[in-house]
Every structure is written in structure tokens, then in C-alpha cells.
Amino acid sequence: QSSERRVVAHMPGDIIIGALFSVHHQPTVDKVHERKCGAVREQYGIQRVEAMLHTLERINSDPTLLPNITLGCEIRDSCWHSAVALEQSIEFIRDSLISSEEEEGLVRCVDGSSSSFRSKKPIVGVIGPGSSSVAIQVQNLLQLFNIPQIAYSATSMDLSDKTLFKYFMRVVPSDAQQARAMVDIVKRYNWTYVSAVHTEGNYGESGMEAFKDMSAKEGICIAHSYKIYSNAGEQSFDKLLKKLTSHLPKARVVACFCEGMTVRGLLMAMRRLGLAGEFLLLGSDGWADRYDVTDGYQREAVGGITIKLQSPDVKWFDDYYLKLRPETNHRNPWFQEFWQHRFQCRLEGFPQENSKYNKTCNSSLTLKTHHVQDSKMGFVINAIYSMAYGLHNMQMSLCPGYAGLCDAMKPIDGRKLLESLMKTNFTGVSGDTILFDENGDSPGRYEIMNFKEMGKDYFDYINVGSWDNGELKMDDDEVWSKKSNIIRSVCSEPCEKGQIKVIRKGEVSCCWTCTPCKENEYVFDEYTCKACQLGSWPTDDLTGCDLIPVQYLRWGDPEP
């Protein structure tokens, strides 16, 4: 499959946009050095490739957007892995370098004669990739060549830093916002003691750092924080689960700033160790409402509360996608491989026939079966439209009164394109306004999802709330059937009247033992007992002292 990575999807045009999608899963630990990618992906891969191809068709047939200019693309596979994505980005850059040299008349053959070789058009911008860690690596390269990058799901806070990532923009908000949303959920249910897990890599690390910082300010204690790679082996996930179990029964809630495949790894370990139902997972948007995370492990995932970027399904994409067939879809070079993987059958007589499948694919197969649209489809399409609107605005200002590419726009100047992109403001695919702040970020709107058992062996994600620019709304009755069902995740119970908290050395502030004050002491504050002065005694509620009334003894009084 090493050669599979070199496969590229092309669509011709006057201006070429690059794209990086995770057409295949990332390499497993043992295959990383070979950069050998995993199995083909539908939602994160094939659907995004098709979204790019079809969205460009729609843009090209829209007479009001870039009239007389055809947009084309070059789509490459990132395999959700930095090394693979960098290798592919170098290919984008190489195209740009060759064509810019050609513009300057520098393309010469070895024997000195002029070249009739017509190089590929340069890439003017790049859509993607999905992962923050990978996006950072790609941006480090692209910005050296002034190539703007628009991400559709890379949400790391680090990417907001324009001194480091000048040519990076995104149609999604920064993770600082969802970290806040997660803390708000923890606060709502009075979970003061939680375990924390994050995916190793930028998305998880920066997100969890923000979650921990915000938690500390809100008096929420982290029992322990763990990190793990998405592609870690079974044993690593087992060890992590055993560590999380060591904080039970106190830390029932596990906040997971994780990629979807990390969550899946946790669920699989729960199955292997017989731990279904022992934890409540609070997951970030890496999990969201993805079925590929929970498939086969629904029992372990039940009760999970997740954050999902607000993005409704795109109907016109489904209308296009569900009609696709391997006999007619030749422009997507990964489609035959995907079809065989999706239906576990062999496309007999096709160039990419896979002999590992015994069953032959029949003609009645359709993508309508168990179809689930990629939850980030709207963002992928908005990122492509952003690039188109940026180019459109640039054309309007550089080529006034001219339809098509004028000389002033050739070759496309990345600096001017970035300027134009940052000013972009249009109505997105779901009717929301797409705009960018000074950091190239988009505003934060999230849905809160809850993974529930809806009937016998039927599970689904239910929308139970929203978080919009700092305001959390939750339907508590939908999450918990009754108040008493609300999970407790606390280290220590409140102390009773007349007791103070004693925090053991090295323990977090949420864990204490309750000690009663002495007979002549009152509770000065939650950590201190103070003795009443001579002649006074603790009040009934033990919060202060009252003077002892003076009683004078008379000769005839009986003995007390």
C-alpha cells in the first residue's frame, strides 16, 4: 500500500486547489517507519474526496462565482499522519516550484534545449488536513511558500497564533471554546473529581491543557491525567484502563480530549477487561456523533456525553454521493478500493480488483445501505467555498470589469490571496455566516450529544443540548431519567456539622477526611477548628462561641 499513497485525484482547471484528506487510516505503530497506511476510510476519506470534486463542479457551474474561471483540484492522501502528509505536501510544493521556474523561463532540458514539457499548474491553496498535529506540520511547510491553508476540522488552539501560522485559517472554532464547554458540563453536574485522557499530539495536548487550566479555576480536581496515541496497541489501552479503574469508585467521569480512534481504543479495552458501565466518558468533538467510534462497542459507550461542532447534514451531497458507482466513477482513484472494502467483495475485471475477497460484487449494491454522512461534511464544503470566495474577491479587486483571469492575477500571489480570504464573509452551506476573526478562526457553536440505548440492542446519539458562545443549555431530563440517576464523580463527601476538612499531604484539594472539632472548639473555616475563649462555649451549630451564663452558687443549692 506504500504506492497507494502516491495516488492523486486530479480535476483540471484554470486555478488548482490542493486538498489533503485521510483517505486511509493512519499507519499502525509497527508500520510507521514504512509510512504504510491502514484501511480505506469512508466518512473521513472517500466522502471528503467526493465532496471536493462535486463542490468544485457546483462552483464552476455557478455563473455568479468566479465567472469564466474554472477551479480544479489535486487531492492527496494524508493518512491522518504527519510524515505521510508532509511527503504529500512536498509534492504540492514541487508542482508550484516547477511551474514558477517555468514562468521565469527556467525550465531547460539537460542538453540545454528548451523544454516542450508542460508542468502542472501550481497549487494556490490547500484544503485540510483534518488532524491538528498534521495541519501544523503542513502549515510549517506551506507558509514558507505563501500558500494559504484552510482547515475544516483542525481545531487546536495553537493554530490561532498568527506569528507562527500566518497562512492558516479554519472554518471551525479553536479548541479553547470546546474545552470551556466541557468544563461547563462538568460544573453543571457537580463533578468535582474527574480523570482525564487525551490523544498524544497537538489536538489532544493543547485541548486537555486548556481543560485542566479552566477546571482548576472552577475548583474541579483531576484525579490523574493520561495520554495515549490513537494507534497505540491493545496493551497500552489495557494499561490505561487499569489506571483509570484505580481511581474508581470516586472518579467515575473520564474527560477525554481525544481523537475518535482513541475513544474507540478505550471502548475496546473496556470490552476486553469487562468494564462496560463503570465510567461516564465526556468526549470532545473528535468523537462527536461518529458511528465508526462506537460500532460493535455500543454497550461500552452508553451514557457518553460528547461535544459536536454544529453542522447539519448537507442534503445535496447525499443526492450526489448515493448515486456513485464503480463502473462510472473514474475520477476518484480510490473509489474501487473503497467499494470492495465497504461491501467486502471483489470487483471482477476492474483495474483495482482485490483478490482477498472471495465474494464478487453484484450490481445491486448501493451506498444507500447504512449510509452515514461525515459529521464534518458542512465544514469541508465551507472550506472549499471559502477558497472560491477568496479567489472571487481577489479577482474582483485585481481584474475590475474583466471576466476570467487577468494578467494582474497571474501567477496568483499567495499574500494577496490570504488578505482576500481573511475578509471573506458569505452564507455557508447550512445557512450560517462564514467569516474569520483576526486569527483566521471561526466562531464556536457546539451541540451536546448523548449516546443512549434507545431499545433492545439499538443505540443512537441524541442531541441533549448546545453551547453557543459561552452559554450552555442542557436537557437534564433527557440525559438522566431521574435526578437520582445523575452520576457522582467526587473524591470526598461534604463534612457534617462540627467537622473540618483535613487534606492529606500530596492530595488534591477535592480529597479530604472529615475530622470533628474538639468539645470546646468551633468550626472557624472549612479547614480550621478554633477553641472558644475561657468563659465561652461553642454554639449549637458549632459556627461560633457564646458566653457561658454566670451562675452564682448559693449555700443551699444542691450539688450539681
Partner: antibody, heavy 121, light 106 residues
Framework: QEQLVESGGGLVQPEGSLTLTCTAS?????????MCWVRQAPGKGLEWIAC???????TWYANWAKGRFTISKTSSTTVTLQMTSLTAADTAAYRC??????????????WGQGTLVTVSS | ALVMTQTPSSVSAAVGGTVTINCQAS??????LAWYQQKPGQRPKLLIY???DLASGVSSRVKGSGSGTEFTLTISDLECADAATYYC????????FGGGTEVVVK
């Protein structure tokens, strides 16, 4: 002192049903350790039947036990095992056991003495 | 389903000697294996967990080793009190016991 005591065993007719009870003393169910049933036919080896989480009431069964055996928590100190469609092959000493750690798949740290179930006409 | 195969079914050794019992798992269970000792009419007693960790109160003459699918229990300096049946238990993706090994001390 931590202790598990089983009761409810006895002679039962083939195709009959029986409910066994395990009563825990000196054990705090809130610690989260799972309660399980293991049986041992006369002169034979140990055979795991089922486990239950005292926290979630989730249950785990050996494949052969699904459908005929039901483990449940009836109070904060008792766990039962309901057995139906019994055959001679189910004749065994049924023991209650507590896991060493939280989770259905764990070593068994504490065992009951067992209650004998005899299936015979 | 997880299946544990224990060998031999019976072994005898003299006082002061050593016995070795093997246990094989039908799938990789890493180190998720326990060993028990059971004497007639008594409940099983946990000796080893996580393949090699000694349970509290167990003599250091008892040693567990192995990982993956192959495991071994070794009892050295045999005493008369070691005469019992020993069981292995795999606890990974299920619970399963081996058939048992009877240890006779001469």
C-alpha cells in the same frame, strides 16, 4: 471479617429452576468489586458462570450460561443466581466469588464455601 | 471464546523437589493470568495474579511466569502442604479456567 455465604442449593428435578443467594458480610459493595458465580461439578474443575457490577448492575456471562442463568443484585449485600431448564450436567457446587479489582474479567480474591445443587429425578 | 488448556493433569514429586505446571491460552491474553490452589473440600485460594505477581500471604517458593499464550507455575522446595489441585485462570475478553493439575507430594 470479609465473608461470602451461599444458600439455596438442594435437589431439583430436571428441567426445573432454582435461585441461589450469595450474602456478603464485612464487604462494602460501594468499593465497586464485582460479584461472580463459579461452579464446580463433583471431582471436576472450576467453571465461570457470570459476574455483576454492584455499581451499574451490568452483567457478564459465559457463552454457555446465557439465557438459562441470570445474575442480579437484590440488595447492597446480596447477589442471586437464577437457574432454569436445569439438567444433570448442572449438578455442581456453586460458589460466589468477589473479584480482586473492578471489572468482570479479574482474578477472584474472595470465595464462598459453596452450595450444592443436585439435578436428579 | 477464551479456552485455557492446562498440562499435565497430574504430577508427583518428592518433598523438597520442584513441580512445573503449564497453561496455554487459546488467544493472546498478555499477562492476564492467575493461579489458584484448591484442597479437597476447601475453596480455591489465589496464589498468583497478572502472571507473576504473588498474592498476599503466599510463599515465595511459588513462582509464576509467561505472557501471551504460554504460562508456567513453578513450586520449589515442595512441602506436604503443597499437595492440592492447581488451576490457572485467564481473564481477558472473558474468564476461563484450565482443567486443573493434581500435585501429589511423596
Amino acid at each position: 471479617q470479609e465473608q461470602l455465604v451461599e444458600s439455596g442449593g438442594g435437589l431439583v428435578q430436571p428441567e426445573g429452576s432454582l435461585t441461589l443467594t450469595c450474602t456478603a458480610s464485612g464487604i462494602d459493595f460501594s468499593s465497586g468489586y464485582f460479584m461472580c458465580w463459579v461452579r464446580q461439578a463433583p471431582g471436576k474443575g472450576l467453571e465461570w458462570i457470570a459476574c455483576i457490577s454492584p455499581y451499574s448492575d451490568n452483567t457478564w456471562y459465559a457463552n454457555w450460561a446465557k439465557g438459562r442463568f441470570t445474575i442480579s443484585k437484590t440488595s447492597s449485600t446480596t447477589v442471586t443466581l437464577q437457574m432454569t431448564s436445569l439438567t444433570a450436567a448442572d449438578t455442581a457446587a456453586y460458589r460466589c466469588a468477589r473479584t480482586m479489582a473492578i471489572g468482570a474479567y479479574n482474578p477472584f480474591k474472595l470465595w464462598g464455601q459453596g452450595t450444592l445443587v443436585t439435578v436428579s429425578s | 471464546a477464551l479456552v485455557m488448556t492446562q498440562t499435565p493433569s497430574s504430577v508427583s514429586a518428592a518433598v523438597g523437589g520442584t513441580v512445573t505446571i503449564n497453561c496455554q491460552a487459546s488467544q493472546n491474553i498478555y499477562s492476564n493470568l492467575a493461579w489458584y490452589q484448591q484442597k479437597p473440600g476447601q475453596r480455591p485460594k489465589l496464589l498468583i495474579y497478572d502472571a507473576s505477581d504473588l498474592a498476599s500471604g503466599v510463599s515465595s517458593r511459588v513462582k509464576g511466569s509467561g505472557s501471551g499464550t504460554e504460562f508456567t507455575l513453578t513450586i520449589s522446595d515442595l512441602e506436604c502442604a503443597d499437595a492440592a489441585t492447581y488451576y490457572c485462570q485467564g481473564y481477558y475478553s472473558g474468564n476461563a479456567f484450565g482443567g486443573g493439575t493434581e500435585v501429589v507430594v511423596k
